[in-house]
């Protein structure tokens, strides 16, 4: 059957009538109800929230709706034990305490179960000592210590604020440096916007609002305790010695009230420079220990939070596609929260419930689309994206072969400046063409595109008249589909302007005062900005499971892969000695770019020139589309990181949020000069040319014609 | 919304002491140090010092060292500022002032100040 | 300590007409954060004083726009555009930066 055949309806107007019934009153609606309560991870009230949208998702119209669930180890405080942080004297007295919670916002005084500020999966301890100040405590924030400065953060508490990089690899590096403890706080430099008022005044993190959030480094396993595999009722797990990624050290986040009380005693050296200064009045001294009068002063943390294995539950909706149901395209996002997720992930979740109610109006009237479209309601995302990678691992086999694309729905908005996509090149003309298509929400483009706002708001760096795409990193719930799997993947939401807001993600984040109000008085009172997404999102989906050819262009791919090419060599050269002595080329590489370049530009010209009345081509060359992102993937993995298969892309090892292009070239050539076996390291960069040249070349040859 | 509020009118004999309390109310006492000021009849604002309730740590301007003592009392969210050794010229009206944290970073908030004075 | 040095002493002005005052500090207020904590407070007659400007121009909560504050490194200015009756009282200048000073005053009167 085409996929006219499959509907009563033209695909043209399957589109519009799908776009058309996305209303932003009921992501308003959906938002409300699922933000009045916490729903964290592991809890009854999320157990709940699992079962409520599992029977709305059915009357919508959705073919089935089963909820699936695994037992992972989560993190919580001590409840009758609480977390805390003290200032004590030479006499052991604590003379300061951190605060125990965040003062509720107005109107939720009342609610129980708010989880107070912790970092999940910290060990327990009571370490004291001396404090040192390590900036965001990125790489280069301990090599500026350790190297420039020669100061020793072994046997120290560092303080670390927030921002930059992902909290995990922040203290994956203070373990690295010899820390035995970490406090995390957030800086108004980074968490408060200039001439914004604090909530509940405005959308402005005050001095008592504390960010939570993992501290892992998982690199894509999962549950720590059952890597490669679904975490089920029969699952052998590892002891928590062998677990995957826990931190080693204790560690507890504060806000910037009592990180004042921290900081302004800090003495010892100097800041490096400027760009250690945050906007607190205090001296930013790095350390080690308090000046003068408080030298005898010490920091200790009491950290008694328990790791545990406890049930999580994924709603996973499928509508079945009438042409090819063996093919997927899925929109996940999560549902658990850190408190009350206004923004995350709720003002996700509802959009995914509206896209999932307008697809289900469409099935209704008698339409279906060409692909299956599952939907996933994720559990555990704030605790490692534990609820997707689990249900992944469990469906992996079923993924590889029959995975089209995947569509991210977290958070829908972190601003309300512009649109800001992240995705694989294959999907970047869907995008362009999508945006093409979409009225802007913007104020002053009206009548106007939103590919026009986009552009014109955010370009592209390389091509003039062009939005910026980003490359996928991690810290979301494509990560699996992605990293591990190879499935093409992309995610977009509404952000903030970068160049004039430099704080890092948004100042409420993870916060309790992440609430619903935060979004309707502040955010998106029309909720436009939740209706754009919602039809960007559930545009991509439609035309991922509806077009008749897969509308993947693979010569975006080819015109980034010359682009990283050209960067990782550039950096290489930054060593010219080395590259002549250890005779490190990238001809390799090149040249399987250019038979890449080549393939692909031949392919395109197939695509268009095909018969496509023939089901057995057509399906031919729509499996040449899809399986171009797994040729991507290396079985081996990563250097270190099994699950992080992607030879093209990986996240940072420096910031799991960022993707990186060539990982495992760039981290061979990372720090390479300072390499004790200098011979060593550069046979390992030769490798990993070898690799990345060999992939590219494969995945080149899956586009040549068959036979 | 946040309040202090001050103890009432104090008249002492040179030589003597007073202690001044001020009940703060409507935040949490802990975040934020409380100031000490005096204004004398028809003069400026002058600073006598400041207490960290969080901690306990105080700072004092170098006229009043030695003369001038700080204490808090976190369980009842007060502040006391006692001044020994009075003389006539510090009549004045005391204030506490709630020092703000960040943004401010200034006295964002007033005691209605407590008038001493000092008399044979 | 850092003296700050207010001009003019008094201010007689008009309603509806605008008005400035002058603070000059001894040294620089430019904290090692790049922040310059001068601030500017109101006392009415009678009252006790009250924030009006935090960090050189920032209006405190319910202060109305018709109050601005400029200046940098030592020279600082506190502008009304528009007087209103209501305005009257002692204007103070202060700075955080060191151990708290405050200047002398600026009397501000209706005509």
């Known amino acids: 059957k085409s996929s006219n055949e499959a509907t009563n309806i033209t695909p043209k107007h399957n589109m519009k009538a799908f776009l058309d019934e996305l209303k932003a009153e009921n992501i308003k609606k959906f938002l409300y109800n699922f933000t009045q309560i916490p729903h964290l991870a592991g809890t009854e009230q999320n157990f709940q929230l699992a079962k409520q949208i599992q029977s709305q998702w059915k009357e919508f119209g959705l073919d089935s709706v089963e909820l699936a669930h695994y037992d992972v180890l989560l993190s919580y405080p001590n409840k009758t034990h609480p977390n805390y942080i003290s200032i004590i004297n030479e006499d052991g007295n604590e003379i300061f305490n951190t605060s125990l919670f965040e003062p509720p916002p107005p109107g939720y005084e009342n609610v129980s179960d708010i989880v107070p500020p912790f970092s999940a999966f910290s060990p327990q301890g009571m370490p004291e000592g001396d404090l040192v100040y390590v900036n965001y405590a990125r790489t280069e924030d301990f090599f500026k210590l350790e190297r420039d400065m020669k100061i020793n953060c072994s046997g120290k508490i560092v303080i670390a604020r927030y921002g930059k990089v992902f909290r995990g690899n922040k203290v994956k590096n203070a373990q690295l440096a010899g820390a035995k403890g970490v406090i995390l706080y957030s800086d108004p430099a980074d968490y408060f916007a200039p001439g914004v008022k604090s909530y509940p005044d405005g959308w402005n993190l005050p001095g008592g609002g504390v960010q939570r959030g993992n501290i892992l480094n998982l690199n894509g396993a999962g549950d720590p305790l059952t890597p490669g595999y679904p975490a089920n009722e029969y699952a052998y797990r590892r002891g928590i010695a062998e677990a995957v990624g826990l931190p080693s050290i204790p560690v507890h986040p504060i806000g910037y009230y009592d990180a004042q009380k921290l900081l302004e005693k800090m003495g010892g050296s100097a800041p490096p420079d400027s760009s250690w200064r945050g906007s607190l009045k205090v001296p930013y001294n790095v350390g080690p220990g308090f000046t003068g009068n408080f030298s005898t002063q010490k920091v200790k943390m009491h950290i008694h939070s328990t790791n545990e294995v406890t049930r999580i539950y994924n709603v996973i909706g499928t509508l079945r596609g009438a042409v090819e149901p063996d093919r997927y395209v899925i929109l996940g996002g999560h549902r658990d929260s850190w408190v009350f997720g206004g923004i995350d992930p709720q003002s996700g979740a509802a959009v995914v419930h509206e896209i999932v109610r307008s697809f289900g109006t469409l099935k209704k009237e008698g339409w279906r689309p060409r692909r299956t479209i599952l939907f996933a309601s994720w559990d555990a995302e704030e605790f490692g994206l534990l609820g997707s990678t689990e249900w992944a691992e469990e469906n992996s086999r079923l993924l590889q072969e029959r995975g089209v694309a995947y569509i991210n729905a977290d958070s829908s908005i972190e601003g309300n400046y512009t649109l800001r996509v992240d995705c694989t090149p294959l999907m970047y003309s869907l995008v362009h063409n999508l945006t093409k298509e979409l009225k802007s929400p913007d104020e002053g483009f009206e009548g106007k595109s939103l590919y026009e706002s986009w552009t014109k708001k955010s370009p592209s760096p390389e091509f003039s008249g062009m939005p910026r795409i980003s490359k996928l990193g991690s810290g979301n719930d494509f990560e699996v589909f992605f990293q591990r799997l190879g499935i093409a993947s992309g995610r977009a939401r509404y952000t903030k302007n970068w160049e004039t807001n430099k704080f890092s993600g948004y100042p409420l984040y993870h916060s309790v005062y992440e609430t619903y109000e935060l979004v309707e008085k502040f955010y998106d009172p029309m909720f436009k900005y939740h209706l754009t997404v919602a039809q960007v999102r559930g545009g991509m989906v439609f035309e991922l499971a509806n077009s008749i050819v897969l509308p993947f262009d693979c010569r975006d791919y080819a015109v980034v892969l010359r682009k990283y090419a050209d960067k990782i060599y550039s950096i290489s050269m930054k060593h010219p000695q080395e590259m002549k002595t250890y005779s490190v080329s990238f001809d390799s590489l090149f040249s399987a770019v250019k038979n890449f370049t080549e393939i692909a530009s031949k392919f395109s010209e197939r695509l268009q020139d095909f018969d496509k009345s023939n089901p057995i081509v057509l399906r031919m060359m729509n499996d040449q589309l899809m399986f171009l992102e797994r040729a991507f993937i290396d079985p081996l993995g990563l250097p270190d990181r099994p699950f992080y298969r992607h030879v093209i892309y990986a996240p940072s090892s420096h910031n799991k949020y960022a993707g990186e292009s060539f990982p495992g070239i760039y981290d061979a050539l990372f720090d390479i000069e300072s390499k004790v076996d200098p011979s060593k390291a550069w046979g390992e960069v030769k490798r990993q040319i070898y690799v990345a040249a060999f992939t590219v070349q494969a995945a080149a040859e899956t586009l040549s014609e068959v036979a | 919304q946040v309040q202090l509020v001050q103890s009432g009118a104090e008249v002492k004999k040179p030589g003597a002491s007073v202690k001044v309390s001020c009940k703060a109310s409507?935040?949490?006492?802990?975040?934020?140090?409380i100031n000490w000021l005096r204004q004398a009849p028809g003069q400026g604002l002058e600073w006598m010092g400041g207490?960290?309730?969080?901690?306990?740590?105080?700072n004092y301007a170098q006229k009043f060292q030695g003369r001038v003592t700080l204490t808090i009392d976190t369980s009842t969210s007060t502040a006391y500022m006692e001044l020994s050794s009075l003389r006539s010229e510090d009549t004045a009206v005391y204030y506490c002032?709630?020092?703000?944290?960040?943004?401010?970073?200034?006295?964002?908030?007033w005691g209605q100040g407590t008038l001493v004075t000092v008399s044979s | 300590d850092i003296v700050m040095t207010q001009s003019p002493l008094s201010l007689p002005v008009t309603p509806g007409e605008p008005a400035s005052i002058s603070c000059r500090s001894s040294?620089?207020?430019?904290?090692?954060?790049?922040?310059?904590?001068l601030h500017w407070y109101l006392q009415k007659p009678g009252q006790s004083p009250q924030l009006l400007i935090y960090?050189?121009?920032n209006r405190f909560s319910g202060v109305p726009d018709r109050f601005s504050g400029s200046g940098s490194g030592t020279d600082f200015t506190l502008k009304i555009s528009r007087v209103e009756a209501e305005d009257v009282g002692v204007y103070y200048c202060?700075?955080?930066?060191?151990?708290?000073?405050f200047g002398g005053g600026t009397k501000v009167e209706i005509k």
């Open positions: 040294q620089s207020l430019v904290h090692s954060n790049g922040q310059t904590y």
């Open positions: 409507g935040y949490t006492f802990t975040y934020f140090d």
């Open positions: 207490i960290s309730p969080g901690d306990g740590n105080t």
């Open positions: 202060s700075q955080s930066t060191h151990v708290p000073t």
């Open positions: 002032a709630r020092d703000g944290n960040f943004p401010y970073y200034a006295m964002d908030s």
């Open positions: 960090t050189v121009s």
